[in-house]
Structures are given as C-alpha cells and as structure tokens.
C-alpha cells in the first residue's frame, strides 16, 4: 500500500516529466522546427490544388504523406520508457510510485503534448496553403485524424518497446510493420483488389485508416471536371468526375459511418496497445 | 611509388574483400531472405493485374513502391567505408595499397554484388506473379532499371558516409534526402502541376528517374478498358483508357528517348556520387 | 447515327507529305472517344496509325511517331492526318475511325485509296 | 508488336457449311480479340469484341472463341453475303491486325 493517492503520484510524475521537456527544450523545439520546414515545404510543392485529374492524385499523394509521416515520426516515441527503464525499476521498487500513476503520467506529461503538436502544425500550414476543402468541420477532422494516427502509432511503439533495454530493436521492428501497413493504406494498391486470403491484414493497418479517414474527408462532394454541361450525356469522358466516384473506386463506403469507424478503429487500436505497454511495465516490476 | 601494380593491389583488396563476405555469411543470406520474402509478399498483395483503373494504380504503386525500397535498402551502403576507416587508414600509410585500389576493390567486391542480388530477385519473383508486360525486353529494362537505381543510391550513401567515423548522422541525412527524393519521384505530386521554381528538384531524384524509366517500360501500348462494347455510348467513361494517356498526364516523354535518358541521368549521379566518395577518401589519407 | 467520311488528294509525290481530312457528322469529336487513322496496304496488312482523343491528347503509332501527325478543327467537327516525307510504302487505303483507346472499331469512313508515285 | 497470324489466307466453302477461320496471336492477348469483316471496296465491319461478344445487329450465325493465343471465328451455315476478307484485331497491348482471311464460295 502507498502513502499517497494515485493523483497525487499522477501528478507528481507528470510535472517532473514536463519539467525534463521544459528544462532540455533542444529536442522538442528541434522537432517543431523540422514539423514548421516539413509542413512549409510540402505546403509549397502542393500549393493550391486543381480540380481535376492531377487534382485527385495530387490530394491523394499529400494525405497518404502526411498519414506515413505521422506513422514513422512516432517511431522516436519509443524512447519514452526504454531511456527511464533503470530509474522507473527504482523509483518503483522505492515504493515512488504504482506502476499506473508512473504509466499515466508520462503519457500525459511527454505522449500527449509532443504528438498533438505536428498535427496541429500540420493542419495548420498544409490546410490553407493547399485550399483543401474549405470548411471548419473538415479542417478539425484532418487535425482530430492526424492526431489519432500520432497517438495510436505512438502507442504501437510503446507496446513494442516498453521493458526493453535497447531501443535499435523496437525501432527496427516498427519501421518494418510500417512498411507492410503502408502498402496497405490505400495508395500503393486498390484495397479492393487484393485476395481475400490476404486482404484482412489491411484492418491491422493504421495510416490505412487514417488515410481513409482523410481521403473520405477532403473528397466527399468534390468535382473533378467542373465546368462540364452535366445534362450532357458525355460528361461521362472523365472517368472520375467526382469525389464520391474516386472514393467507392478505392472501395471507401459514402456514409457518415465511413468516416467515423476509421477513428473507432484507431481508439480502439490506442486502447489495446497502451494496455499491452502497461501489462509489459507491470510485467517487468515482477521481474525486476 | 608501390612494389605492386594498380592491379594487383585491386586483386588483392577485392579477394580479401570477397572472403570477408563469405566468410561472414549471415549478413548476405539474410539479405537475400528478406529480400525473396519482400518479394512474395509484393507479388502476394499485387498478384495479376488487371488491365483497368485498379491496373493503373496498382502498377504505378508497385513500381513506386519498388523504387523507393532500393532506395531506402541502400542506405546500409554507408557501412562501406565507415567500419574499415582505421584499418584503411592503417594499411594506406604503411604502403599497402593506393587509394585507387581500395576503392575499386571494395566497389568490385562488396558494392557490386550485394546491389546486383535484391533486382534480379525482385524481378524474377514480381514480374510473373504480378503479370507485368509480357516481353524478354520489358523484364531485363525493369531488372537494369532497379540496379540502377540501386548503385546511384548506394553511391550517394558512399558519397555521404565515405571518410566519416559514426555510420547514424550519414544514416539520418541519407533518409532525410530519400524522403524529399521520394515526393518529388512523381506518384505523390503530379510532377507537372509544381510550381517552375522548385520542380527542378525533381532531377535531382534518384527514385524520380528509377519509377519514371519503370513507367514508361511497363506503361507504354497498354490497354486499361479493353473489351468494351464499342457501339455503347458509355465507352467514354474511362479517361486513361491507353497507358500512354496516362504517361502523358504524369508529363512523361514517350519517345525511346524518354525511357533511356532516366538511365543516362542514373549513370551520371552513380559517377558523380563514386567521384566524390573517391575525392573523399584521399582528402582523409591527407589528413591521417 | 455517327458518319465518318475521308477526303483528300489521291496522289502524292514521294517525299512530300500526305495530308488527308476526316468530317464527322452525327457526333460532336469534343465530346468523346478516340478518333482514330487506319490504313489497309495493297497486300491487305492493315495498321493502327495513332489518334487524336477527345480532350486532344494525340498517340501514334512508334513506327511513325517521327513523321505523323494528327490535329483537329473543333468548329468544322473536323480531324486531319498529316504524313511526312511519304515513300511508294505508304501506299494504302486511309480509313478515319472512332473507338476508345485501341478497342475494337465499330464506326469506319469508307477509305480513301491513297497511291505514292512520281 | 503482337504478330497476328491468320489461316488459311483464302478459303472456299459451300452455301449452308460450317466455317472456321483461325487467327494465332504472338503473345497472350488476355482474350481481347475482335474480329471484321470487310466487303470489296467497303470499310471494315465489326463482327465480334472480345473474342465472343456479338457486336449489335450481327447475326447469331457468327461467333468467336478461344484464349490465350489460340482464337477462331465460326460462321455456323455459310450464306452468299457472307463472301468476303475477314481480319482479327489484337487490342491487349497497342493494336494490331491478322493479314486477313479471303473467304469465297465454291
């Protein structure tokens, strides 16, 4: 039994870990510099997108980007309970702390605050300087999607690195899973092509739902060939005239739901993960 | 002045080399393992393509995502140089060899081979499966253009590491150069659509002209809605119907020219790059 | 119903070019498919010669992409071929057809016989 | 290019026979085949798409098979309208024709 309450150690443990972040800023505002540059630099080679054929391959290609590059950027997240192994196996067996009030505070202190930032970042710079679809609602669902394939890449890394010593292994082992869930997020190879005895691994992929998630986000109510006399019965010389045509060819379903279940799927991804990486922590206590 | 010849030094450099990698062959198996497994798998998700819009994608993104993966797998060519620098260093000054000689042996030896595998291997195992263009010519351009591909990266890798003591700062800064490469390689942006002032980065991209040779080899007399009943208006709703439409789009030349100046461009960086790296290792002998 | 007819001079001197005109009727070019030159040689081998799409995107055969050349007049619904530096080999009946990519030709012009003599 | 080969190059057969014409494609062609028929001084007429298909207002007595490299075109009862050339059409990778069937009554 401990002598003060799960908050108190919550809390206790979440201010030295924003203290260490503050207190050694190099690392964090390094990686705002290079998410400002990343961000200015995508923004300039995207800049202002057209409404027709390279238009769609143009806002897939970003939002498969920005979807990768959040998933291989959390790769560093690994780092968060390898570099304090020895000191966490201490303080707790010093009776510090219990292992969740530990578990939880890094996670709120250093997890939460340093993958929230390139989201917003992101979305803030990319948004405009590309002219993706200008509405609120679309703008905070890009930012709320690039958030949540931040948080459960990251939470993937935490599950495969926490209790290890080393982090080469768990880097090495992420970026490989990385690789194979890129391949099946949606741009590299229609979805709806692959065999079925193959094509289940797709659900195990997270930027497939992210890049799913952004591409039914920005597309749905997009027109590809503007401008065409519609009542003509040729308007049907562009093979892909609107959004809702591109996304049921990548064998995205128009609803609502079709949106929405990508992010239910990245929670639900979050949730088992990070209790894979408590469980580990825990585990290691006993072997500690 | 040397007791030896330029080419019996190259000999000796070569063998030792060779013998080393023999001897130590976990290294090189593993390699080709990895490299048979990755290709299953590409053939596996890409299996026969169809000759649609699905065919268009997915051709495109196995061919990217074949590029880039000989990209990125070159980067360990930085070890080249780098864990040998001591004892290059020590068998230089004592008169062993010239610099001319290592360099070429190791090239020989350990660069030449262990590029050369991974294309024949990737070539072999995905051409039949996925179905690719079924002529002699067509498959030994995409297995030529992959391992020119491979020896301009690995180049730039030596170009970057050779001289250098720690192998992760030219690690970091050769995948920094591999993901801007890999935007400006023409299936995330529309290479036509970027603004005059930063599309000539794109000739700087080695994985630019590595999928732009595979495009036009793989692409060109390609039909994407065959068998359409040709009297029924809606015949028109495919907008790439031939693969040179879609290379049109892409803004790819279609002449004989605009396949074989990728490789010319290829040939030019791997000399450049091995120019550096040479320039480099007798800057540090200088310095020793 | 879509008509094809081709016109142009029968008779061209070697090393000249050979230009031929496609009128259609019944269907506007602006507005789909592929509008495609055939032609038959005397032996009867027939060969694709290239096209000219509706958005006015042009694919010619490699075997003579250095000397054909096909343009349009969208204000007369007219295409043209255009042949250069002609020998006796390009002899042959010209045909105008309309299709999509290199799918089948449902919609042929009559022909008209082209002969290359001095 | 796909070479398309066809036989026999001229063929006589009588009113009410069955008829098959062979066309051999260099490579496989994924069954994207076509087959036309063309009267002296006519243009081509399209007979059949994708090695069966019956092209609209041809009749049933035409028809198409075979894969792969191997395709016939049969015409089950000859009749006199039928005499005249008959090319096949590859249109899996470019376009290219057979050197044609020159069909004639005996």
């Known amino acids: 039994s401990y002598t003060t309450s799960f908050c108190h150690q919550l809390r206790w443990v979440s201010k030295r870990s924003f203290k260490n972040l503050l207190g050694n800023p190099q690392a964090s505002i390094a990686q705002i510099i290079v998410t400002v540059i990343l961000g200015l630099v995508i923004g300039a080679i995207y800049f202002g997108l057209n409404n027709d054929s390279t238009g769609i391959q143009n806002r897939a290609g970003v939002l498969f980007f920005l979807t990768t590059n959040q998933c291989f950027s959390s790769v560093s997240a690994v780092e968060l309970f390898v570099v304090e192994k020895k000191l966490f196996i201490h303080e707790y067996i010093s009776g510090y702390y219990r292992v969740s009030s530990y578990f939880f505070g890094k996670l709120l202190s250093d997890l939460l605050p340093m993958r929230m930032l390139p989201s917003i970042i992101f979305t803030c710079i990319v948004y405009f300087m590309l002219g993706l679809k200008p509405t609120a609602d679309a703008f905070f669902i890009m930012m709320f999607t690039l958030m949540m394939v931040a948080y459960s890449a990251s939470s993937m890394a935490l599950a495969i690195a926490a209790g290890q010593s080393v982090v080469s292994v768990a880097t090495l082992l992420m970026t490989i899973c990385f690789v194979f869930m890129m391949i099946f997020s949606g741009l590299l190879v229609n979805l709806t092509t692959i065999a079925s005895w193959l094509s289940w691994l797709q659900y195990f992929s997270i930027p497939r739902y992210g890049f799913t998630a952004l591409q039914h986000n920005e597309f749905l109510g997009q027109n590809f060939c503007p401008g065409l006399n519609a009542t003509v019965n040729n308007t049907c010389n562009y093979a892909t005239c609107t959004g809702e045509e591109y996304l049921t060819k990548q064998g995205i379903d128009l609803s609502p739901w079709g949106l929405w279940k990508n992010h239910v799927a990245l929670a639900c991804m979050i949730v088992i993960f990070l209790t894979i990486a408590y469980l580990k922590l825990l585990f290691l206590k006993k072997y500690s | 002045s040397y007791t030896t010849s330029f080419c019996h030094q190259l000999r000796w450099v070569s063998k030792r080399s060779f013998k080393n990698l023999l001897g130590n062959p976990q290294a090189s198996i593993a390699q080709i393992i990895v490299t048979v497994i990755l290709g299953l798998v590409i053939g596996a998700i890409y299996f026969g393509l169809n000759n649609d819009s699905t065919g268009i994608q997915n051709r495109a993104g196995v061919l990217f995502f074949l590029t880039t993966n000989q990209c990125f797998s070159s980067v360990s060519a930085v070890e080249l140089f780098v864990v040998e620098k001591k004892l290059f260093i020590h068998e230089y000054i004592s008169g062993y060899y010239r610099v001319s000689s290592y360099f070429f042996g190791k090239l020989l030896s350990d660069l030449l081979p262990m590029r050369m595998l991974p294309s024949i291997i990737f070539t072999c195992i995905v051409y039949f499966m996925l179905g690719l263009k079924p002529t002699a010519d067509a498959f030994f351009i995409m297995m030529f253009t992959l391992m020119m591909v491979a020896y301009s990266a690995s180049s730039m890798a030596l170009a970057i590491a050779a001289g250098q003591s720690v192998v992760s700062v030219a690690t970091l800064l050769m995948t920094i150069c591999f993901v801007f490469m890999m935007i400006f390689s023409g299936l995330l942006v529309n290479l036509t659509t970027i603004a005059s002032w930063l599309s000539w980065l794109q000739y700087f991209s080695i994985p630019r002209y590595g999928f732009t040779a595979l495009q036009h080899n793989e692409f060109l007399g390609q039909n994407f809605c065959p068998g359409l009943n040709a009297t029924v208006n809606n015949t028109c709703n495919y907008a790439t119907c031939t693969g040179e439409e879609y290379l049109t789009k892409q803004g790819i030349d279609l002449s004989p020219w605009g396949l074989w100046k990728n490789h010319v461009a290829l040939a030019c960086m791997i000399v450049i790059f091995l120019t550096i790296a040479y320039l480099k290792l007798l800057f540090l002998k200088k310095y020793s | 119903e879509v008509q094809l007819v081709e016109s142009g001079p029968g008779l061209v001197k070697p090393s000249q070019s050979l230009s031929l005109t496609c009128s259609v009727t019944g269907y506007t070019i602006t507005s789909g498919y592929d509008w495609t030159w055939i032609r038959k040689f005397p032996g009867n081998k027939m060969e694709w010669m290239g096209y000219?799409?509706?958005?006015?995107?042009?694919n010619y055969n490699p075997s003579l992409r250095s000397r054909i050349s096909i343009t349009r007049d969208t204000s007369k619904n007219q295409f043209f071929l255009q042949l250069n530096s002609v020998t006796t080999e390009d002899t042959a009946t010209y045909y105008c057809?309309?299709?999509?990519?290199?799918?089948?030709?449902?919609?042929w012009g009559q022909g008209t016989l082209v002969t290359v003599s001095s | 290019d796909v070479v398309m080969t066809q036989s026999p190059s001229l063929l006589s057969a009588s009113v009410g026979d069955r008829v098959t014409l062979s066309c051999k494609a260099g490579r496989n062609i994924n069954n994207y085949l076509a087959w036309y028929q063309q009267k002296l001084g006519k243009a081509p007429k399209l007979l059949i798409y994708n090695t069966n298909s019956l092209q609209t207002g041809i009749p049933s007595r035409f028809s198409g098979s075979g894969s792969g490299t191997d395709f016939t075109l049969t015409i089950s009862s000859l009749q006199p309208e039928d005499v005249a050339t008959y090319f096949c059409q590859q249109y899996n990778s470019w376009t290219t024709f057979g050197s044609g069937t020159k069909l004639e009554i005996k």
């Open positions: 057809t309309r299709t999509r990519g290199y799918n089948p030709f449902a919609y």
């Open positions: 000219i799409s509706y958005s006015g995107f042009t």
